[in-house]
Amino acid sequence: AWELTILHTNDVHSRLEQTSEDSSKCVNASRCMGGVARLFTKVQQIRRAEPNVLLLDAGDQYQGTIWFTVYKGAEVAHFMNALRYDAMALGNHEFDNGVEGLIEPLLKEAKFPILSANIKAKGPLASQISGLYLPYKVLPVGDEVVGIVGYTSKETPFLSNPGTNLVFEDEITALQPEVDKLKTLNVNKIIALGHSGFEMDKLIAQKVRGVDVVVGGHSNTFLYTGNPPSKEVPAGKYPFIVTSDDGRKVPVVQAYAFGKYLGYLKIEFDERGNVISSHGNPILLNSSIPEDPSIKADINKWRIKLDNYSTQELGKTIVYLDGSSQSCRFRECNMGNLICDAMINNNLRHTDEMFWNHVSMCILNGGGIRSPIDERNNGTITWENLAAVLPFGGTFDLVQLKGSTLKKAFEHSVHRYGQSTGEFLQVGGIHVVYDLSRKPGDRVVKLDVLCTKCRVPSYDPLKMDEVYKVILPNFLANGGDGFQMIKDELLRHDSGDQDINVVSTYISKMKVIYPAVEGRIKFSTGSH
């Protein structure tokens, strides 16, 4: 028997520095977690102790903090090289700055293979990107070889900016011939490494003949065997065992997100490359693991540029940006409108001639808007200003919901109106009218939504049975502020870009902004 140790990360999302337990900015260092310096300590410790070790990343290193905003992926290449990753799969967020924003900082600089079998380049891009990413790679580990085959969510064109010259094929269809090719090369130990979410990971384990292990990402899935060491609730045991269609037991793993854990999976293979046993658990990277001093010094060196960036002007406002709780928790506020407009703008994807865009709607809990911005400071808006408005380090995500769920959400928005509670929704692409004289749960008297399958966008009444795409904070997608119906009833959830980054990009693009209060949210006469 031959034993392989797979160390894995996914959805790190720019958390190069240690973070607080909830993966936001580290405040009390003695209670902080993750970060590449701490990760390196643990990885090196395992490399020294065990003979056959692979360090893999399942995508979405890009996007999530000011590190990515400033360094645009150069930080990913630099620190992944420093940690000596063995391979990485492309995630959807690796395309956030377009294909050029992937090639220049990452693909050209990585000292490790970057993989995806289901992304096919066409047109002029085919030669430009040739050899910079691969469908699979065979890596020597000890005296054996291991094949690693990559995959990426086929929804990427709706979630990011890969352009028109990359085709995202069905994962299973694309993976099978590559795995077959590895078999003909006498590679009998094959890991599928990819970024399509836990459900697809399980399907790959079930359907792709010859895949021995699946290491996934995208859904931020936390798996654990035994008592979990922090706040994350396991979605299943680690590894999650799937019985393949040809009767094999295939371990599937994922390691939550944000570099908080290091996935640790030990696999035992027989001489024919069959998995005999698999066991392990994600390792919580808490403060009991010291940060490696040389990586930490390098982080501090790279940090300097970030501090300078946060005070630079992004754009100007010529109006007061009302982000006060007195406004945003009670009525339409122009800060809410600005943020929602930025959220929609960030999700413009012309992927189908029938649709002017794939999504037109935004909802945003008023309680998530934490500060106004005064225009009397020469109109200047900085990252620092925006960090005061959106201090929680969240993301603006894409969900699919039924109209009936949206209706419940808007009822929840005003079910206890008047108490300055955070659930009052700010909107974009939605016209809502409330009658507060009616009883809670029956206060939405009009709910019109902007069409997407139209050449001239207009507002139509919400249909209860129709499925709509909506952009919202991850906080709401996870049921925050009492929006349990969103969490329970959402049909799809894809994590998006860092909230501040979305707004800062929009302001930089617009240069001068002047959002108004324009009647998106109304109260029927006599009730307000």
Partner: antibody, heavy 117, light 106 residues
Amino acid sequence: QVQLVQSGAEVKKPGASVKVSCKASGYTFTSYWMHWVRQAPGQGLEWIGEINPSIGRTNYNEKFKSRVTLTRDTSTSTAYMELSSLRSEDTAVYYCARRVYGTMDYWGQGTLVTVSS
Amino acid sequence: DIQMTQSPSSLSASVGDRVTITCKASQDINSYLSWFQQKPGKSPKLLIYRANIWVDGVPSRFSGSGSGQDYTFTISSLQPEDIATYYCLQYDELYTFGQGTKVEIK
């Protein structure tokens, strides 16, 4: 297939400059960094520097920094290495090489530069 | 600057022999080490990178190993066509070649 074709041999006087070219074909020139390496007669390999053809960014060996200039012409997929203030110890074969995964995969055929009075 | 010390500078072995060349870095180079083969009058050819990863088409008798500061290149069974000079290259921090090892047949 990937090919790096270098300019012909040069004979230069001490104090002069030389400019060696390296024309890339079989791949997209701007997608990979280009290295320059030299080898004096009967000696080992010595790294000179590298250039990112898409943006023109360069990294140099400290030893050559004051005398070497790496440039490129993306319209002709050609990289250039110019070495100034030549001295006899600069007599060497100069190679261009494409960078991949941080190392050098494809190499040009080499250009012999002879510095002699 | 990282220094690379390659040894031996030359060796003579018989066909079928196992040949070993070592490279020692002045500091940990994170396995970012390549091995090249250069035949007389020819350009160098990449054989192995990242300490142990073969380039496609390179015969399996060539192998690399090592980590930290110490690396080894092995020809498991020397063939007449392997007569060449072999160089290591560190690419962890910029680039430094070893001095080379000339391999001859007895």
